[in-house]
Amino acid sequence: MGNSCYNIVATLLLVLNFERTRSLQDPCSNCPAGTFCDNNRNQICSPCPPNSFSSAGGQRTCDICRQCKGVFRTRKECSSTSNAECDCTPGFHCLGAGCSMCEQDCKQGQELTKKGCKDCCFGTFNDQKRGICRPWTNCSLDGKSVLVNGTKERDVVCGPSPADLSPGASSVTPPAPAREPGHSPQIISFFLALTSTALLFLLFFLTLRFSVVKRGRKKLLYIFKQPFMRPVQTTQEEDGCSCRFPEEEEGGCEL
Protein backbone atom coordinates (compact mmCIF):
# COMPACT_ATOMS: atom_id res chain seq x y z
CA MET A 1 0.00 0.00 0.00
CA GLY A 2 2.73 2.45 1.06
CA ASN A 3 4.73 1.49 -2.00
CA SER A 4 1.91 2.42 -4.40
CA CYS A 5 1.40 5.75 -2.62
CA TYR A 6 5.10 6.47 -3.04
CA ASN A 7 4.82 5.70 -6.78
CA ILE A 8 1.89 8.10 -7.23
CA VAL A 9 3.68 10.93 -5.39
CA ALA A 10 6.85 10.31 -7.41
CA THR A 11 4.90 10.40 -10.69
CA LEU A 12 3.13 13.62 -9.72
CA LEU A 13 6.43 15.29 -8.84
CA LEU A 14 7.90 14.18 -12.17
CA VAL A 15 4.94 15.61 -14.11
CA LEU A 16 5.01 18.91 -12.22
CA ASN A 17 8.75 19.18 -12.71
CA PHE A 18 8.39 18.45 -16.44
CA GLU A 19 5.75 21.17 -16.80
CA ARG A 20 7.99 23.65 -14.94
CA THR A 21 10.99 22.75 -17.07
CA ARG A 22 8.91 23.00 -20.24
CA SER A 23 7.70 26.49 -19.37
CA LEU A 24 11.27 27.51 -18.58
CA GLN A 25 12.51 26.06 -21.87
CA ASP A 26 9.52 27.35 -23.89
CA PRO A 27 8.13 30.60 -22.48
CA CYS A 28 5.69 30.68 -25.44
CA SER A 29 3.56 27.98 -23.81
CA ASN A 30 2.46 30.63 -21.30
CA CYS A 31 0.95 32.85 -23.99
CA PRO A 32 -2.86 32.63 -23.78
CA ALA A 33 -5.40 32.66 -26.61
CA GLY A 34 -5.68 36.11 -28.14
CA THR A 35 -1.92 36.62 -28.00
CA PHE A 36 1.12 35.34 -29.89
CA CYS A 37 4.69 34.67 -28.84
CA ASP A 38 6.69 37.54 -30.32
CA ASN A 39 10.17 36.32 -31.30
CA ASN A 40 11.20 39.88 -32.17
CA ARG A 41 10.49 41.02 -28.63
CA ASN A 42 12.29 38.40 -26.57
CA GLN A 43 9.40 35.94 -26.79
CA ILE A 44 7.00 38.25 -24.98
CA CYS A 45 3.30 37.50 -25.33
CA SER A 46 1.92 40.22 -27.59
CA PRO A 47 -1.79 40.74 -28.30
CA CYS A 48 -2.98 39.77 -31.77
CA PRO A 49 -3.00 42.78 -34.12
CA PRO A 50 -6.34 44.04 -35.51
CA ASN A 51 -8.14 41.65 -37.91
CA SER A 52 -6.28 38.61 -36.57
CA PHE A 53 -6.89 36.03 -33.83
CA SER A 54 -5.41 33.05 -31.98
CA SER A 55 -7.93 30.57 -30.64
CA ALA A 56 -5.39 28.52 -28.66
CA GLY A 57 -2.53 29.34 -26.33
CA GLY A 58 1.16 29.08 -27.18
CA GLN A 59 0.83 30.25 -30.78
CA ARG A 60 3.78 31.94 -32.49
CA THR A 61 1.52 33.75 -34.97
CA CYS A 62 -2.05 35.00 -35.12
CA ASP A 63 -4.35 33.89 -37.94
CA ILE A 64 -5.92 36.43 -40.30
CA CYS A 65 -9.66 36.89 -39.68
CA ARG A 66 -12.07 35.62 -42.29
CA GLN A 67 -13.76 38.48 -44.15
CA CYS A 68 -17.39 38.11 -45.14
CA LYS A 69 -17.69 39.92 -48.45
CA GLY A 70 -19.95 39.89 -51.48
CA VAL A 71 -22.68 37.28 -51.14
CA PHE A 72 -21.38 36.44 -47.63
CA ARG A 73 -22.42 38.49 -44.63
CA THR A 74 -21.00 38.56 -41.11
CA ARG A 75 -22.87 36.42 -38.63
CA LYS A 76 -20.27 36.74 -35.86
CA GLU A 77 -17.54 39.36 -35.72
CA CYS A 78 -13.90 38.33 -35.42
CA SER A 79 -12.43 38.67 -31.93
CA SER A 80 -8.86 38.26 -30.70
CA THR A 81 -9.69 34.66 -29.71
CA SER A 82 -12.11 33.50 -32.44
CA ASN A 83 -12.51 33.79 -36.18
CA ALA A 84 -15.38 35.60 -37.86
CA GLU A 85 -18.35 33.48 -38.97
CA CYS A 86 -20.20 34.15 -42.20
CA ASP A 87 -23.60 33.28 -43.52
CA CYS A 88 -25.27 34.20 -46.81
CA THR A 89 -27.19 37.29 -47.84
CA PRO A 90 -30.97 36.91 -48.29
CA GLY A 91 -31.78 34.86 -51.38
CA PHE A 92 -28.84 32.52 -50.78
CA HIS A 93 -28.07 29.70 -48.36
CA CYS A 94 -24.88 28.18 -46.93
CA LEU A 95 -23.15 25.13 -48.31
CA GLY A 96 -20.07 23.32 -47.04
CA ALA A 97 -18.34 23.29 -43.67
CA GLY A 98 -18.38 26.67 -41.95
CA CYS A 99 -20.46 28.14 -44.78
CA SER A 100 -17.65 27.99 -47.32
CA MET A 101 -20.05 28.60 -50.22
CA CYS A 102 -23.35 30.36 -50.85
CA GLU A 103 -25.94 28.86 -53.19
CA GLN A 104 -28.96 30.60 -54.69
CA ASP A 105 -32.34 29.93 -53.05
CA CYS A 106 -35.24 28.70 -55.14
CA LYS A 107 -38.96 28.87 -54.42
CA GLN A 108 -40.74 25.94 -52.87
CA GLY A 109 -41.70 23.58 -55.70
CA GLN A 110 -38.47 24.30 -57.58
CA GLU A 111 -34.90 23.06 -57.80
CA LEU A 112 -31.67 24.77 -58.80
CA THR A 113 -30.29 23.72 -62.18
CA LYS A 114 -27.46 25.08 -64.36
CA LYS A 115 -30.08 27.29 -65.99
CA GLY A 116 -31.40 28.61 -62.67
CA CYS A 117 -34.50 27.67 -60.67
CA LYS A 118 -36.86 25.27 -62.45
CA ASP A 119 -40.25 23.92 -61.39
CA CYS A 120 -40.41 20.34 -60.16
CA CYS A 121 -41.64 17.84 -62.76
CA PHE A 122 -45.02 16.18 -62.24
CA GLY A 123 -44.72 13.46 -59.61
CA THR A 124 -41.91 15.21 -57.75
CA PHE A 125 -41.83 17.90 -55.06
CA ASN A 126 -39.50 20.15 -53.08
CA ASP A 127 -40.78 21.70 -49.84
CA GLN A 128 -37.57 23.65 -49.28
CA LYS A 129 -35.66 26.54 -50.82
CA ARG A 130 -32.64 24.34 -51.41
CA GLY A 131 -32.06 20.79 -52.65
CA ILE A 132 -33.60 18.81 -55.47
CA CYS A 133 -37.11 17.78 -56.42
CA ARG A 134 -37.84 14.32 -55.00
CA PRO A 135 -40.45 11.79 -56.14
CA TRP A 136 -43.69 11.68 -54.20
CA THR A 137 -43.93 8.97 -51.56
CA ASN A 138 -45.28 5.68 -52.92
CA CYS A 139 -47.87 4.92 -50.24
CA SER A 140 -48.44 1.35 -51.45
CA LEU A 141 -44.89 0.38 -50.47
CA ASP A 142 -46.13 0.64 -46.88
CA GLY A 143 -49.47 -0.94 -47.69
CA LYS A 144 -51.19 2.41 -47.28
CA SER A 145 -53.47 4.48 -49.45
CA VAL A 146 -53.13 8.07 -50.67
CA LEU A 147 -54.86 10.37 -48.21
CA VAL A 148 -53.90 13.67 -49.87
CA ASN A 149 -52.47 14.07 -53.37
CA GLY A 150 -49.05 15.61 -53.80
CA THR A 151 -48.18 18.88 -55.51
CA LYS A 152 -44.85 20.27 -56.69
CA GLU A 153 -44.52 22.00 -53.30
CA ARG A 154 -45.49 19.12 -51.05
CA ASP A 155 -45.46 15.37 -50.77
CA VAL A 156 -48.34 12.95 -50.97
CA VAL A 157 -49.86 12.11 -47.58
CA CYS A 158 -50.32 8.42 -46.88
CA GLY A 159 -53.04 7.05 -44.68
CA PRO A 160 -54.32 3.68 -43.60
CA SER A 161 -55.90 1.33 -46.12
CA PRO A 162 -59.65 2.05 -46.40
CA ALA A 163 -60.41 -1.21 -44.56
CA ASP A 164 -58.49 -0.02 -41.48
CA LEU A 165 -60.30 3.30 -41.24
CA SER A 166 -63.08 4.15 -38.84
CA PRO A 167 -64.92 7.10 -40.46
CA GLY A 168 -63.00 10.36 -40.12
CA ALA A 169 -60.16 9.12 -37.98
CA SER A 170 -56.81 8.01 -39.30
CA SER A 171 -53.61 6.84 -37.71
CA VAL A 172 -50.41 8.73 -38.44
CA THR A 173 -48.38 5.53 -38.23
CA PRO A 174 -50.98 2.81 -38.81
CA PRO A 175 -50.23 -0.91 -38.89
CA ALA A 176 -49.36 -1.90 -42.44
CA PRO A 177 -51.82 -4.51 -43.73
CA ALA A 178 -50.37 -7.53 -45.52
CA ARG A 179 -50.23 -6.55 -49.15
CA GLU A 180 -47.60 -7.56 -51.65
CA PRO A 181 -45.19 -4.61 -51.89
CA GLY A 182 -44.76 -2.79 -55.16
CA HIS A 183 -48.37 -2.95 -56.31
CA SER A 184 -49.34 0.71 -56.49
CA PRO A 185 -53.04 1.75 -56.33
CA GLN A 186 -52.74 2.79 -59.99
CA ILE A 187 -51.79 -0.76 -61.11
CA ILE A 188 -54.55 -2.33 -59.03
CA SER A 189 -57.08 0.15 -60.46
CA PHE A 190 -55.88 -0.70 -63.99
CA PHE A 191 -56.38 -4.44 -63.48
CA LEU A 192 -59.82 -3.86 -61.95
CA ALA A 193 -60.79 -1.73 -64.93
CA LEU A 194 -59.49 -4.40 -67.31
CA THR A 195 -61.46 -7.16 -65.57
CA SER A 196 -64.62 -5.03 -65.56
CA THR A 197 -64.24 -4.32 -69.29
CA ALA A 198 -63.75 -8.02 -70.04
CA LEU A 199 -66.88 -8.91 -68.06
CA LEU A 200 -68.88 -6.20 -69.87
CA PHE A 201 -67.69 -7.53 -73.23
CA LEU A 202 -68.73 -11.03 -72.22
CA LEU A 203 -72.15 -9.81 -71.18
CA PHE A 204 -72.46 -7.81 -74.40
CA PHE A 205 -71.42 -10.86 -76.45
CA LEU A 206 -73.95 -13.15 -74.74
CA THR A 207 -76.74 -10.61 -75.22
CA LEU A 208 -75.89 -10.28 -78.88
CA ARG A 209 -75.64 -14.03 -79.31
CA PHE A 210 -79.21 -14.50 -78.18
CA SER A 211 -80.65 -11.50 -80.02
CA VAL A 212 -78.80 -11.68 -83.34
CA VAL A 213 -78.85 -15.44 -83.99
CA LYS A 214 -81.48 -15.02 -86.77
CA ARG A 215 -79.67 -12.11 -88.50
CA GLY A 216 -76.66 -14.12 -89.67
CA ARG A 217 -72.96 -13.77 -88.82
CA LYS A 218 -71.81 -10.97 -91.15
CA LYS A 219 -73.22 -8.12 -89.08
CA LEU A 220 -71.85 -9.57 -85.84
CA LEU A 221 -68.35 -9.73 -87.29
CA TYR A 222 -68.60 -6.06 -88.28
CA ILE A 223 -69.59 -5.02 -84.74
CA PHE A 224 -66.55 -6.79 -83.26
CA LYS A 225 -64.16 -5.43 -85.85
CA GLN A 226 -65.06 -1.79 -85.27
CA PRO A 227 -63.59 -1.24 -81.77
CA PHE A 228 -60.24 -2.66 -82.81
CA MET A 229 -60.01 -0.40 -85.83
CA ARG A 230 -60.54 2.83 -83.90
CA PRO A 231 -57.22 3.09 -81.98
CA VAL A 232 -55.25 3.15 -85.25
CA GLN A 233 -57.08 6.30 -86.22
CA THR A 234 -56.55 7.80 -82.73
CA THR A 235 -52.78 7.34 -82.81
CA GLN A 236 -52.58 9.04 -86.16
CA GLU A 237 -54.46 12.03 -84.78
CA GLU A 238 -52.12 12.22 -81.75
CA ASP A 239 -49.02 12.38 -83.92
CA GLY A 240 -49.71 16.06 -84.49
CA CYS A 241 -48.78 17.14 -80.93
CA SER A 242 -46.39 15.97 -78.23
CA CYS A 243 -47.54 14.82 -74.82
CA ARG A 244 -46.05 17.06 -72.12
CA PHE A 245 -46.50 17.67 -68.42
CA PRO A 246 -48.23 20.95 -67.48
CA GLU A 247 -45.01 22.07 -65.74
CA GLU A 248 -43.09 21.69 -68.99
CA GLU A 249 -45.43 24.04 -70.79
CA GLU A 250 -44.50 26.71 -68.24
CA GLY A 251 -40.90 26.18 -69.27
CA GLY A 252 -40.06 24.78 -65.88
CA CYS A 253 -39.46 21.09 -66.11
CA GLU A 254 -36.34 19.44 -67.45
CA LEU A 255 -36.48 15.69 -67.89
Epitope: D127, K129, R134, L147, V148, E153, V172
Partner: antibody, heavy 127, light 110 residues
Framework: EVQLLESGGGLVQPGGSLRLSCAAS????????MSWVRQAPGKGLEWVSV????????YYADSVKGRFTISRDNSKNTLYLQMNSLRAEDAAVYYC????????????????????WGQGTLVTVSS | QSVLTQPPSASGTPGRRVTISCSGS????????VTWYQQLPGTAPKLLIY???HRPSGVPDRFSGSKSGTSASLAISGLRSEDEADYYC???????????FGCGTKLTVL
Protein backbone atom coordinates in the same frame (compact mmCIF):
# COMPACT_ATOMS: atom_id res chain seq x y z
CA GLU B 1 -45.83 2.46 -27.26
CA VAL B 2 -43.67 5.48 -28.14
CA GLN B 3 -41.59 6.67 -25.20
CA LEU B 4 -39.26 9.68 -25.14
CA LEU B 5 -37.28 10.56 -22.05
CA GLU B 6 -35.34 13.82 -21.88
CA SER B 7 -32.44 14.44 -19.49
CA GLY B 8 -29.53 16.84 -19.00
CA GLY B 9 -31.43 19.95 -17.98
CA GLY B 10 -30.40 22.08 -15.03
CA LEU B 11 -29.09 25.43 -13.87
CA VAL B 12 -26.37 27.05 -15.95
CA GLN B 13 -24.78 30.50 -16.02
CA PRO B 14 -25.15 32.82 -19.04
CA GLY B 15 -22.47 31.92 -21.58
CA GLY B 16 -22.34 28.36 -20.27
CA SER B 17 -23.03 25.07 -22.00
CA LEU B 18 -25.39 22.15 -21.51
CA ARG B 19 -26.06 18.91 -23.38
CA LEU B 20 -29.56 17.49 -23.47
CA SER B 21 -30.30 13.85 -24.27
CA CYS B 22 -33.50 12.11 -25.32
CA ALA B 23 -33.73 8.32 -25.00
CA ALA B 24 -36.28 6.86 -27.41
CA SER B 25 -38.07 3.51 -27.31
CA UNK B 26 -41.18 1.81 -28.71
CA UNK B 27 -40.48 2.67 -32.37
CA UNK B 28 -37.78 2.36 -35.03
CA UNK B 29 -35.78 5.43 -34.05
CA UNK B 30 -33.63 5.40 -37.19
CA UNK B 31 -36.70 5.83 -39.41
CA UNK B 32 -38.06 9.12 -38.11
CA UNK B 33 -37.29 12.85 -38.12
CA MET B 34 -36.70 14.13 -34.59
CA SER B 35 -37.11 17.66 -33.24
CA TRP B 36 -36.42 19.69 -30.13
CA VAL B 37 -39.21 22.09 -29.12
CA ARG B 38 -38.99 24.45 -26.16
CA GLN B 39 -41.45 26.32 -23.99
CA ALA B 40 -40.41 29.22 -21.78
CA PRO B 41 -42.36 29.47 -18.49
CA GLY B 42 -45.87 30.77 -19.20
CA LYS B 43 -45.13 31.13 -22.94
CA GLY B 44 -45.98 29.24 -26.13
CA LEU B 45 -44.21 26.45 -27.99
CA GLU B 46 -41.09 27.32 -29.99
CA TRP B 47 -39.51 24.89 -32.44
CA VAL B 48 -35.73 24.70 -31.95
CA SER B 49 -34.24 22.18 -34.35
CA VAL B 50 -34.89 19.07 -36.47
CA UNK B 51 -32.64 16.26 -37.68
CA UNK B 52 -33.46 13.87 -40.54
CA UNK B 53 -32.46 10.20 -40.27
CA UNK B 54 -31.74 9.46 -43.92
CA UNK B 55 -29.32 12.24 -44.90
CA UNK B 56 -28.53 13.61 -41.43
CA UNK B 57 -29.73 17.05 -42.54
CA UNK B 58 -30.29 19.52 -39.71
CA TYR B 59 -32.27 22.75 -39.47
CA TYR B 60 -32.38 25.34 -36.70
CA ALA B 61 -34.53 28.24 -35.57
CA ASP B 62 -32.80 31.59 -36.20
CA SER B 63 -32.71 32.24 -32.46
CA VAL B 64 -30.32 29.31 -31.81
CA LYS B 65 -28.34 29.12 -35.08
CA GLY B 66 -24.60 28.84 -34.48
CA ARG B 67 -25.04 28.15 -30.76
CA PHE B 68 -27.01 24.88 -30.64
CA THR B 69 -26.16 21.60 -32.37
CA ILE B 70 -28.63 18.74 -32.83
CA SER B 71 -27.31 15.21 -33.33
CA ARG B 72 -28.48 11.63 -33.07
CA ASP B 73 -27.02 8.21 -32.38
CA ASN B 74 -29.25 5.67 -34.10
CA SER B 75 -27.37 2.75 -32.52
CA LYS B 76 -28.23 4.11 -29.06
CA ASN B 77 -31.73 5.36 -29.99
CA THR B 78 -30.75 8.74 -28.58
CA LEU B 79 -31.23 12.33 -29.70
CA TYR B 80 -28.94 15.12 -28.43
CA LEU B 81 -28.94 18.89 -28.21
CA GLN B 82 -25.62 20.59 -27.48
CA MET B 83 -26.32 24.11 -26.21
CA ASN B 84 -23.45 26.60 -26.09
CA SER B 85 -23.28 30.34 -25.28
CA LEU B 86 -26.53 30.06 -23.36
CA ARG B 87 -28.60 33.20 -22.78
CA ALA B 88 -31.32 34.08 -20.29
CA GLU B 89 -33.91 33.78 -23.09
CA ASP B 90 -32.94 30.11 -23.63
CA ALA B 91 -34.44 29.19 -20.26
CA ALA B 92 -37.35 26.84 -20.94
CA VAL B 93 -38.70 23.32 -20.76
CA TYR B 94 -37.12 21.43 -23.68
CA TYR B 95 -39.24 18.72 -25.30
CA CYS B 96 -37.97 15.99 -27.57
CA UNK B 97 -40.50 15.21 -30.32
CA UNK B 98 -40.89 12.40 -32.87
CA UNK B 99 -42.31 13.23 -36.29
CA UNK B 100 -44.82 10.98 -38.04
CA UNK B 101 -44.12 9.39 -41.43
CA UNK B 102 -41.47 6.68 -41.47
CA UNK B 103 -38.47 7.18 -43.73
CA UNK B 104 -37.16 6.31 -46.27
CA UNK B 105 -40.64 5.32 -47.53
CA UNK B 106 -42.05 8.73 -46.61
CA UNK B 107 -40.12 11.49 -48.36
CA UNK B 108 -41.28 14.37 -46.14
CA UNK B 109 -42.60 14.25 -42.58
CA UNK B 110 -43.98 17.79 -42.46
CA UNK B 111 -47.56 16.63 -43.15
CA UNK B 112 -47.70 14.20 -40.26
CA UNK B 113 -46.78 16.52 -37.42
CA UNK B 114 -45.01 15.61 -34.21
CA UNK B 115 -46.91 12.57 -32.99
CA UNK B 116 -44.76 11.66 -29.99
CA TRP B 117 -43.53 13.92 -27.18
CA GLY B 118 -41.39 13.52 -24.08
CA GLN B 119 -42.30 15.09 -20.74
CA GLY B 120 -39.57 17.71 -21.08
CA THR B 121 -36.45 18.77 -19.17
CA LEU B 122 -36.09 22.20 -17.56
CA VAL B 123 -33.16 24.43 -18.47
CA THR B 124 -32.55 27.45 -16.22
CA VAL B 125 -30.07 30.14 -17.28
CA SER B 126 -29.20 32.47 -14.44
CA SER B 127 -26.18 34.05 -12.80
CA GLN C 1 -43.58 37.59 -32.41
CA SER C 2 -44.82 34.42 -34.10
CA VAL C 3 -44.98 33.92 -37.87
CA LEU C 4 -48.42 32.28 -37.43
CA THR C 5 -51.13 34.42 -35.86
CA GLN C 6 -53.66 32.93 -33.44
CA PRO C 7 -56.13 34.67 -31.14
CA PRO C 8 -54.72 34.59 -27.58
CA SER C 9 -57.96 33.29 -26.13
CA ALA C 10 -61.28 31.67 -27.02
CA SER C 11 -64.22 30.50 -24.94
CA GLY C 12 -67.47 28.61 -25.19
CA THR C 13 -70.09 26.88 -23.10
CA PRO C 14 -70.37 23.08 -22.85
CA GLY C 15 -72.06 21.50 -25.86
CA ARG C 16 -71.39 24.48 -28.13
CA ARG C 17 -68.99 24.81 -31.05
CA VAL C 18 -65.84 26.95 -31.01
CA THR C 19 -63.41 27.78 -33.82
CA ILE C 20 -59.75 28.79 -33.48
CA SER C 21 -58.08 30.50 -36.42
CA CYS C 22 -54.46 30.46 -37.55
CA SER C 23 -53.20 32.92 -40.12
CA GLY C 24 -49.92 32.73 -42.03
CA SER C 25 -48.46 33.40 -45.47
CA UNK C 26 -47.67 31.64 -48.76
CA UNK C 27 -44.28 30.51 -47.46
CA UNK C 28 -45.88 28.53 -44.63
CA UNK C 29 -49.62 27.74 -44.48
CA UNK C 30 -50.23 28.62 -48.15
CA UNK C 31 -48.07 25.82 -49.53
CA UNK C 32 -47.58 23.46 -46.59
CA UNK C 33 -49.57 21.14 -44.38
CA VAL C 34 -50.94 22.47 -41.11
CA THR C 35 -50.91 20.51 -37.86
CA TRP C 36 -52.71 21.29 -34.59
CA TYR C 37 -51.65 20.45 -31.04
CA GLN C 38 -53.49 20.39 -27.73
CA GLN C 39 -51.60 21.07 -24.51
CA LEU C 40 -53.50 20.35 -21.32
CA PRO C 41 -52.25 22.21 -18.21
CA GLY C 42 -48.95 20.83 -16.94
CA THR C 43 -48.56 18.24 -19.69
CA ALA C 44 -46.66 17.80 -22.95
CA PRO C 45 -48.39 18.76 -26.23
CA LYS C 46 -50.44 16.16 -28.11
CA LEU C 47 -51.02 15.94 -31.87
CA LEU C 48 -54.65 16.70 -32.67
CA ILE C 49 -54.80 17.27 -36.45
CA TYR C 50 -52.27 16.51 -39.20
CA UNK C 51 -52.17 17.25 -42.96
CA UNK C 52 -54.66 20.15 -42.56
CA UNK C 53 -57.73 18.10 -41.66
CA HIS C 54 -56.88 14.53 -40.64
CA ARG C 55 -57.26 13.12 -37.15
CA PRO C 56 -54.82 10.59 -35.67
CA SER C 57 -56.50 7.50 -34.20
CA GLY C 58 -57.80 8.18 -30.71
CA VAL C 59 -58.72 11.82 -31.37
CA PRO C 60 -62.49 12.33 -31.08
CA ASP C 61 -64.38 13.40 -34.21
CA ARG C 62 -65.51 16.51 -32.33
CA PHE C 63 -62.17 17.99 -33.46
CA SER C 64 -61.86 19.00 -37.10
CA GLY C 65 -59.35 21.00 -39.11
CA SER C 66 -59.67 22.95 -42.34
CA LYS C 67 -57.54 25.22 -44.49
CA SER C 68 -58.20 27.91 -47.06
CA GLY C 69 -55.41 29.84 -48.73
CA THR C 70 -53.03 31.13 -46.07
CA SER C 71 -55.36 30.50 -43.12
CA ALA C 72 -56.29 27.40 -41.16
CA SER C 73 -58.97 26.68 -38.57
CA LEU C 74 -59.56 24.21 -35.78
CA ALA C 75 -63.19 23.57 -34.86
CA ILE C 76 -64.30 21.87 -31.66
CA SER C 77 -67.95 20.87 -31.50
CA GLY C 78 -69.85 19.55 -28.48
CA LEU C 79 -67.48 21.41 -26.19
CA ARG C 80 -66.53 19.62 -22.95
CA SER C 81 -64.79 20.81 -19.80
CA GLU C 82 -61.81 18.52 -20.55
CA ASP C 83 -61.20 20.50 -23.78
CA GLU C 84 -59.94 23.42 -21.68
CA ALA C 85 -56.32 23.70 -22.86
CA ASP C 86 -53.88 25.62 -25.04
CA TYR C 87 -54.14 24.96 -28.79
CA TYR C 88 -51.28 25.53 -31.23
CA CYS C 89 -51.16 25.48 -35.00
CA UNK C 90 -47.87 24.62 -36.70
CA UNK C 91 -46.43 24.17 -40.18
CA UNK C 92 -43.19 24.12 -42.16
CA UNK C 93 -41.95 27.51 -43.41
CA UNK C 94 -39.79 27.09 -46.49
CA UNK C 95 -38.35 30.62 -46.39
CA UNK C 96 -37.17 30.12 -42.81
CA UNK C 97 -36.19 26.48 -43.47
CA UNK C 98 -37.86 25.42 -40.25
CA UNK C 99 -41.08 24.62 -38.44
CA UNK C 100 -43.15 27.43 -36.99
CA PHE C 101 -45.76 27.40 -34.23
CA GLY C 102 -48.59 29.81 -33.67
CA CYS C 103 -48.48 31.75 -30.40
CA GLY C 104 -51.23 29.53 -28.99
CA THR C 105 -54.87 30.01 -28.05
CA LYS C 106 -56.10 29.43 -24.51
CA LEU C 107 -59.53 27.81 -24.64
CA THR C 108 -61.81 28.33 -21.66
CA VAL C 109 -64.95 26.25 -21.21
CA LEU C 110 -67.38 28.47 -19.32
Amino acid sequence: EVQLLESGGGLVQPGGSLRLSCAASGFTFSGYDMSWVRQAPGKGLEWVSVIYPDDGNTYYADSVKGRFTISRDNSKNTLYLQMNSLRAEDAAVYYCAKHGGQKPTTKSSSAYGMDGWGQGTLVTVSS
Amino acid sequence: QSVLTQPPSASGTPGRRVTISCSGSSSNIGNNYVTWYQQLPGTAPKLLIYADSHRPSGVPDRFSGSKSGTSASLAISGLRSEDEADYYCATWDYSLSGYVFGCGTKLTVL
